[in-house]
């Protein structure tokens, strides 16, 4: 059962598994949610104790019954992990805490104009977990405006003290706001020789990378595969760090793989969700339960629904035994990873999908695309929306993309002459315009946010956000697309598609079925040559065939230029402008979404 409320002046008795320091009960709940075993917690505020060393303690708790006795204690705040909830969970914490100093290893000190600048510095520093900033009112003159960057082994403070005239807060790496480069490559036959901060068992290098990504101290990893010569090290995932943030030595060794944490490209890649099945593999760990079920998918579902289950092994039934039901072993461990991995056992193993909700919904795999043809099929582009105007009569106005459960990203030029959001309707999960009838449900628009530097499509800043009146429930046919990660600045996208209900040629009409076209990106230099009368800025991105023939056209405006990279779709561009449609040597010009990620996050998180 999902319990989101906090219980004031209540202490949960017993079940302690760890104690950390957090600046608030809300943050304690997030830490509990991300801890592999924590189901409940008790946070001690300032008023709960005479002893300042006990302030801000967050005691993480576990219980076989998923509950603990409640004891009245002034100043204590208790609650439950969000593991039991189905809603989206984020480790992102943008709060700034006044007159608190979160303790850690202070490794960098520099002047900053503001707490925000200090937080940005922390976010863009590979080692930084949190910071403390001394304001200009700080008593010690030499420390005024000093920004202290801090880290700890666990990523949480080693203590929290009251300190006047300072503010403290966390790195925003987990909010996908880091400008650090994001290295997605996994290097085969490579060992990184640097200090190990931890080691866990993993079935493959990709699970190892995910574990590294959400381990606060891990910057890169080495994984020894099943074929590694030393038996005791097989399936071992070594979590590593270095002072520079990069491996100091790379050793060529076959059957080992190495790679980097994806901490700076969060939100556009699954980090918590290990959805694969591992055949002929047993995961060892503490047994929680053994249940007879039909098939490994059912076993995974059972594990996902059991809040304490972290991973499972399914032993298929022997032919014609037990109505085809095999044994499903639900398991857990102290760190969420198997204590040992055995191969050649005939079992099928995997992980709970409970943690998938900690990843951005946009990273969820969608059904495979139908190759060939220009008409889309249902669920192929679940982020695509059709924006209608009801004035003077109802018609399709523009495309748009779902980027959050209350947010549509589209083009600013769509709203020329639109006086009020009241005349707009957003239809989601639509394939054919003919599906839209009088009684078809739609989302009203609460607010239109147009970039304040927008003048006309050709001069850039052709971007707008629509805040919906109600929130979207995600399904297979309606879900968000990932924004490009700022760490992905150097990614070359090769699988890009433009979609919309727009004209198929210059003088045409709106199409009934959502159309799709695969279009290659064009460099800005090349694009500039094709549009000598315009300035193609870095805030624009171009796509099209030299010979023409495939392009976005009237009615596609505001819709997505979607590019698939590492199995995840990214909203790379917003259909903006072009000379004619699909003309030879006239690529389509799109708003370069990467350049507006900060603007999007600022607007969507402030509203």
């Amino acid at each position: 059962e999902c319990v989101t409320r906090l219980f004031k002046d209540i202490h949960f008795e017993g079940g302690d598994i760890a104690t950390v320091f957090t600046p608030s009960a809300k943050h304690c709940q997030v830490v509990c949610t991300h801890h592999p075993r924590c189901l409940l917690f008790t946070f001690t505020g300032e008023s709960a104790s005479e002893d300042p060393t006990q302030w801000f303690t967050c005691v993480l708790k576990d219980s076989v019954t998923e509950t603990l006795p409640r004891v009245n204690r002034t100043g204590a705040i208790s609650g439950y992990s969000f593991k039991q909830c189905s809603h989206q969970i984020s480790a992102c914490n943008k709060d700034i805490y006044v007159d608190l100093d979160m303790k850690g290893i202070n490794y960098n000190s520099s002047l900053a104009k503001s707490a925000q600048e200090c937080q940005e510095r922390c976010t863009d520093d590979i080692h930084c977990h949190f910071f403390t900033y001394a304001t200009r009112q700080f008593p010690s003159l030499e420390h005024r405006n000093i920004c202290l960057l801090k880290h700890t082994q666990t990523g949480t403070p080693t203590g929290i003290m009251k300190l006047d005239k300072v503010v403290t807060g966390f790195s925003l790496k987990s909010c996908a706001l880091s400008n650090l480069a994001c290295i997605r490559d996994v290097f085969p036959n490579t060992v990184f020789a640097d200090s190990n901060i931890d080691s866990v068992m993993a079935p493959d290098a990709f699970v190892c990378r995910r574990i590294c990504t959400h381990h606060p101290g891990c910057l890169f990893f080495t994984f020894f595969s099943q074929e590694w010569p030393k038996e005791s090290q097989r399936n071992l995932c070594l979590l590593k760090t270095s002072e520079s943030g990069l491996p100091s030595t790379r050793i060529k060794k076959s059957k080992a793989l190495s790679g980097f944490s994806l901490q700076s490209c969060r939100h556009s890649i699954p980090v918590f969700c290990h959805s694969s099945f591992y055949h002929d593999t047993d995961f060892l760990g503490e047994e929680l339960d053994i249940v007879a079920v039909k098939g490994h998918e059912a076993c995974q579902k059972l594990c996902t629904n059991a809040v304490r289950c972290q991973f499972f092994t399914y032993a298929p039934a022997q032919a014609s035994c037990n109505e085809g039901k095999g044994k499903c072993y639900l398991k857990l461990s102290s760190n969420g990873s198997p204590t040992k991995i055995l191969r050649g056992t005939g079992g099928i193993s995997g992980y709970t999908l409970r943690l998938c909700k900690m990843d951005n919904e946009c990273t969820t795999k969608i059904k495979p695309r139908i190759v060939g043809g220009t008409a889309s099929v249902r669920g192929e582009w679940p982020w695509q929306v059709t924006l209608h105007t009801t004035s003077p009569t109802q018609r399709h106005l523009c495309g748009g993309s779902i980027i959050g459960n209350q947010w549509i990203l589209t083009a600013a030029h769509c709203f020329y002459g639109v006086e009020s959001p009241k005349i707009l309707r957003v239809y989601i999960g639509i394939l054919n315009q003919s599906e839209i009838k009088e009684d078809t449900s739609f989302f009203g628009v609460q607010e239109i946010i147009i970039h304040d530097q927008y003048k006309m499509a050709e001069s850039g800043y052709d971007i707008a956000l629509l805040k919906l009146e109600t929130t979207v429930n995600y399904t297979d046919s309606q879900r968000p697309i990932c924004l490009p990660s700022k760490g992905d600045r150097n990614v070359i996208y090769t699988d890009c598609w433009v979609t919309g209900w727009g004209y198929r040629k210059l003088r045409d009409k709106i199409q009934n079925t959502l159309q799709k076209a695969k279009i290659p990106l064009v460099t800005n230099d090349e694009c500039q040559k094709r549009y000598r009368g315009h300035k193609i800025t870095h805030k624009m991105i171009c796509a099209g065939y030299r010979e023409g023939g495939k392009d976005a056209c009237k009615g596609d405006s505001g819709g997505p230029l979607s590019c698939k990279h590492n199995e995840v779709w990214h909203l790379v561009g917003i259909t903006s402008w072009g000379e004619g449609c699909a003309q030879r040597e006239r690529p389509g010009v799109y708003t370069n979404v990467l350049e507006y990620v900060d603007w999007i996050l600022e607007k969507t998180q402030a509203a």
Epitope: S109, T132, L141, E142
Partner: antibody, heavy 124, light 107 residues
Framework: EVQLVQSGAEVKKPGASVKVSCKAS????????MHWVRQAPGQGLEWMGI????????SYAQKFQGRVTMTRDTSTSTVYMELSSLRSEDTAVYYC?????????????????WGQGTTVTVSS | EIVMTQSPATLSVSPGERATLSCRAS??????LAWYQQKPGQAPRLLIY???TRATGIPARFSGSGSGTEFTLTISSLQSEDFAVYYC?????????FGGGTKVEIK
């Protein structure tokens, strides 16, 4: 042992520039600020400015603004103070002095370690 | 800028006697005040910081008091090595400023 060792005495002509160095040892150079203080013959102490060796940020006394430049070289744990457009009244002993520990936000402990001083004589 | 005024300019004291030095700030500097001792041909040496805290290795005969605008350095029993010039310095606001100094000489 914590030490600040300054460069030797200098004799300069009016209008010239002088660059005094101060090499730190025995502690983590980038963790403490560094001040420059001067003392004219028979006079009191006069604060000139401060540098944060970690980021290189500086703050100068209004009197020296535009004439003084403080820099640092983290590879050699050395700070430098350059004073330009020298005049006779710049004749003084120039001291570097270690300031606050910048990796902890507790209060200032004063200038606890001083260099031996560098005599700069400005004379035509 | 904050002006620091020390008095007296010269203090004549016999060894073993008590010496009291004053320092006044033109505006409040809270407790952000330090005292230094300087002997001829030597660099200054930190005695007191935070108005009343003795620096490492400073004998107990040196004590500081005061806050706001009025501060005192007391040497309870003068030793021969204590005859020197003493400076107060505020570190409450930029620019840092020193007093003109008090010379403690043998009576």
């Amino acid at each position: 042992e914590v030490q600040l060792v300054q460069s030797g005495a200098e004799v300069k002509k009016p209008g010239a520039s002088v660059k005094v160095s101060c090499k730190a040892s025995g502690y983590t150079f980038t963790s403490y600020s560094m001040h420059w203080v001067r003392q004219a013959p028979g006079q009191g102490l006069e604060w000139m400015g401060i540098i944060n060796p970690s980021g290189g940020s500086t703050s100068y006394a209004q009197k020296f603004q535009g004439r003084v430049t403080m820099t640092r070289d983290t590879s050699t744990s050395t700070v430098y103070m350059e004073l330009s457009s020298l005049r006779s009244e710049d004749t003084a002993v120039y001291y570097c002095a270690r300031g606050a520990y910048l990796l902890e936000l507790y209060y200032y402990y004063g200038m606890d370690v001083w260099g031996q001083g560098t005599t700069v004589t400005v004379s035509s | 800028e904050i002006v620091m005024t020390q008095s007296p300019a010269t203090l004549s004291v016999s060894p073993g006697e008590r010496a009291t030095l004053s320092c006044r700030a033109s505006q409040s500097v809270s407790s952000n005040l330090a005292w230094y001792q300087q002997k001829p041909g030597q660099a200054p040496r930190l005695l007191i910081y935070g108005a009343s805290t003795r620096a490492t290795g400073i004998p107990a005969r040196f004590s500081g008091s005061g806050s706001g605008t009025e501060f005192t350095l007391t040497i309870s029993s003068l030793q021969s090595e204590d005859f020197a010039v003493y400076y107060c310095q505020q570190f409450n606001d930029w620019p840092l400023t020193f007093g003109g100094g008090t010379k403690v000489e043998i009576k």
